[in-house]
């Protein structure tokens, strides 16, 4: 436990301020698996990488939180970062 959380945090901390902002906006509309809720917009937009990691893990749990983070990174054109995140999660 904790490996996925660390991988999410590592990915988010490697985003520029502009990319982190874009990540949050995409997270608001990313397709979710059935029955998954959405993090409220108000809470999301002011978060830094650490707060956002904690929110993703508490809201979606580690495994799906990491998968969702990777998908948003892919939507942003950051496939390499997404792959690194998933590789770190599945070590």
């Amino acid at each position: 436990m904790g490996r996925a959380r660390d991988a999410i945090l590592d990915a988010l901390e490697n985003l520029t301020a502009e990319e982190l902002k874009k990540f949050k906006l995409k997270l608001l509309s990313v397709p979710l698996r059935e029955a998954a809720g959405r993090i409220p917009r108000g809470a999301l937009l002011s978060m830094d990488a650490l707060d956002l990691t904690d929110k993703l893990v508490s809201f979606y749990l580690e495994t799906y939180g990491a998968e969702l983070t990777a998908n948003v990174l892919r939507d942003m054109g950051l496939q390499e970062m997404a792959g690194q995140l998933q590789a770190a999660t599945h070590q």
Partner: antibody, heavy 114, light 107 residues
Framework: QVQLQQPGTELVKPGASVKLSCRAS?????????????LEWIGNINLSNGRTNYN??FRAMATLTVDKSSSTAYTQLSSLTSEDSAVYYC?????????????WGQGTSVTVSS | NIVMTQYPKSMSLSIGERVTLRCKAS??????VSWYQQKPEQSPKLLIY???NRYTGVPDRFTGSGSATDFILTITSVQAEDLADYHC?????????FGAGTKLELK
């Protein structure tokens, strides 16, 4: 409808270089298509931050750059051979999810011939 | 690199027929597959993204389905203007890759 502007044709000699341009925004991809063949992704560049990704197959011959002031993406193709005669498309990814190429330029036809 | 295999390579058909085009990825690409239509001497045009999302303005006779490694583009009733090359592509991993294409021709 976004229009990606590309020049129509370029005639270059073997061993020479050519610099192709594309007025675009966001992530801009470059795609090669030889006559009667499929599509090959060369690489892409993010116009807002200059971040690039390359297909290793093209890394030695293609250099992707951007001029933010004119919202223009460039690819410089060097040491050209007849195998590089093709149509080169630029394309944008503007759809928010799944990163498809939703806008395509009309393509620049590059002919390598002495 | 992820290899995208399209089949059949070509299809001869009559107007009004139902057509199924297939695309297989060499590894799991989730839903990160798009379908493009390309007419002679024209640029490719996006039809379907995210495996099943129809792009703006695309007629509803075009339907995408599948996930992971197996993907399908269905044209329920082919029109004359649908005769073209169709390419699938994945955006799950770099390098982005495309299939070799399927050509739809008139019988």
């Amino acid at each position: 409808q976004v229009q990606l502007q590309q020049p129509g044709t370029e005639l270059v000699k073997p061993g020479a270089s050519v610099k192709l341009s594309c007025r675009a925004s966001g992530w801009t991809h470059w795609v090669k298509q030889r006559p009667g063949q499929g599509l090959e992704w060369i690489g892409n560049i993010n116009l807002s931050n200059g971040r690039t990704n390359y297909n290793e197959k093209f890394r030695a011959m293609a250099t992707l750059t951007v001029d933010k002031s004119s919202s223009t993406a460039y690819t410089q193709l060097s040491s050209l051979t007849s195998e590089d005669s093709a149509v080169y498309y630029c394309a944008n990814s503007m759809v928010p999810h799944f990163f498809p190429m939703d806008y395509w330029g009309q393509g620049t036809s590059v002919t390598v011939s002495s | 690199n992820i290899v995208m295999t399209q089949y059949p390579k070509s299809m001869s058909l009559s107007i009004g027929e139902r057509v199924t085009l297939r695309c297989k990825a060499s590894e799991n690409v989730g839903s990160y597959v798009s379908w493009y239509q390309q007419k002679p001497e024209q640029s490719p045009k996006l039809l379907i993204y995210g495996a099943s999302n129809r792009y703006t303005g695309v007629p509803d006779r075009f339907t995408g389905s599948g996930s992971a490694t197996d993907f399908i583009l269905t044209i329920t009733s082919v029109q004359a203007e649908d005769l073209a090359d169709y390419h699938c592509g994945q955006s799950y991993n770099y390098p982005l890759t495309f299939g070799a294409g399927t050509k739809l021709e008139l019988k």
